[in-house]
Amino acid sequence: AGVFELQIHSFGPGPGPGAPRSPCSARLPCRLFFRVCLKPGLSEEAAESPCALGAALSARGPVYTEQPGAPAPDLPLPDGLLQVPFRDAWPGTFSFIIETWREELGDQIGGPAWSLLARVAGRRRLAAGGPWARDIQRAGAWELRFSYRARCEPPAVGTACTRLCRPRSAPSRCGPGLRPCAPLEDECEAPLVCRAGCSPEHGFCEQPGECRCLEGWTGPLCTVPVSTSSCLSPRGPSSATTGCLVPGPGPCDGNPCANGGSCSETPRSFECTCPRGFYGLRCEVSGVTCADGPCFNGGLCVGGADPDSAYICHCPPGFQGSNCEKRVDRCSLQPCRNGGLCLDLGHALRCRCRAGFAGPRCEHDLDDCAGRACANGGTCVEGGGAHRCSCALGFGGRDCRERADPCAARPCAHGGRCYAHFSGLVCACAPGYMGARCEFPVHPDGASALPAAPPGLRPGDPQRYL
């Protein structure tokens, strides 16, 4: 068990252009309050689920009236911390939603009017017992600065508040199997407190309040032995000396939870985890309307005027989900062409282009050869965002500035001698071989292995192939 604590430091206009209008005016004075909702885990579905870890509402802040003509300053805040007690272990990873609400104090008929000013959400890792973590979140033109921490309530300790500490009974050491509670060396780890009535012989727990059964035992308190033989044979009324297991329909078969709720089995019944906007045993009741501001990230809410009708969020570009809570990975569509690097900046996409390409999506192929010369008669060839020179014979290198040694690769076969020539190379063949690279043997009967001689030449004539 423990408490999650949230301290709001400031709420006001964020940096950059487009400062928001003050939420209050001389005609309509108002005051702020905050709501925090916590959910375990880092799952994408977090925004859809109820505040399973808990929720809290702050006190109302001081009444604020806008000074005419003045920009909206940081608004006056409620005093104190928002505290969300948690009964079980602290999960270590959690999702949060912090809402800033405005309470208008004008002459409303029927009391004050409330409206949602801003909502921020995030996912974080946090160990219980650690220092305050600072955070800044933006919602539209507003900026919220806050700190948070999770702390264990005695006797719980540890990063998950699952270890329990008790003052030492003996001055020198802790009981068998129990360690000192660092940093409280004068205290000892206490055994976990399982669910009341959990069998000490056949049950155990890994978290306070649970009761898990050892093999061969069953029941909510692990007091019923599992019988492999029949336990329904006639043996007098209502005997309970052995438990038995019988097959049957699953409690969640056919999913009893409506409106997309997820069902989980419990020993005596089932439980529905309802999506945002629904509640009730089977998630059959819709309780959220557009007045509750259910759409995240600037989504437009439509419908939901009466409590029984659902609402629909029309999401701005870059967001999706029934509450616009999921950011679309727009780079996954690979909008940047020609190998450009995609950057999703939230408000816009940017493509960082490779050399030789330009345009919002790197769609323009620049003239790679513009202003680039190839030396010694070489010609420039465009391609792939870089220029390449096709060099004249006898030259090489990126710009054809290097004189090539045509004999370096030993092109003459069968012991032929290579000579560099202004127009290439010449092979002087060893006896018995012929051809431009001395690749063909001359047969003893005077016929060569040449498949066919070029017109005007007889096989066996001395020749030079360039």
Epitope: T218, V224, A240, V246, G250, P267, R268, S269
Partner: nanobody, 126 residues
Framework: EVQLVESGGGLVQPGGSLRLSCAAS????????IGWVRRAPGKGEELVAR????????RYADSVKGRFTISADTSKNTAYLQMNSLRAEDTAVYYC???????????????????SGQGTLVTVSS
């Protein structure tokens, strides 16, 4: 002392109906789930119907779905099983049992029974 007493069994023709009753004492049925388990000759036990009296939620085995209806009257601490369109294969001893979900194993959901009655015989025959 916990007690469950079944009644209402008997001989019935195929297509006929019977209503079984289960009177509970020694505990409050609204705090538990109650099921009807049957054992047919030469077969194992099977939980055919189950009710959570707190919310009236019911589950049925596929073999009886649409023909059997389980209900409970918490003011009388009694559960009922209305059996319609009975078939020869429904012939079995029917036990009222206090049950809770145990878990899923080898392709089946299992329920633990901690108390059951002495059973009532239902025979479907022409």
């Amino acid at each position: 002392e916990v007690q469950l007493v079944e009644s209402g069994g008997g001989l019935v023709q195929p297509g006929g109906s019977l209503r079984l009753s289960c009177a509970a004492s020694g505990f409050n049925i609204s705090e538990h789930s109650i099921g009807w388990v049957r054992r047919a000759p030469g077969k194992g036990e099977e939980l055919v119907a189950r009710i959570y009296p707190t919310n009236g939620y019911t589950r049925y085995a596929d073999s009886v779905k649409g023909r059997f209806t389980i209900s409970a009257d918490t003011s009388k601490n009694t559960a009922y099983l209305q059996m319609n369109s009975l078939r020869a294969e429904d012939t079995a001893v029917y036990y009222c049992a206090r049950s809770y979900y145990h878990g899923y194993s080898h392709g089946h959901h299992y329920y633990a029974i901690d108390y059951s009655g002495q059973g009532t015989l239902v025979t479907v025959s022409s």
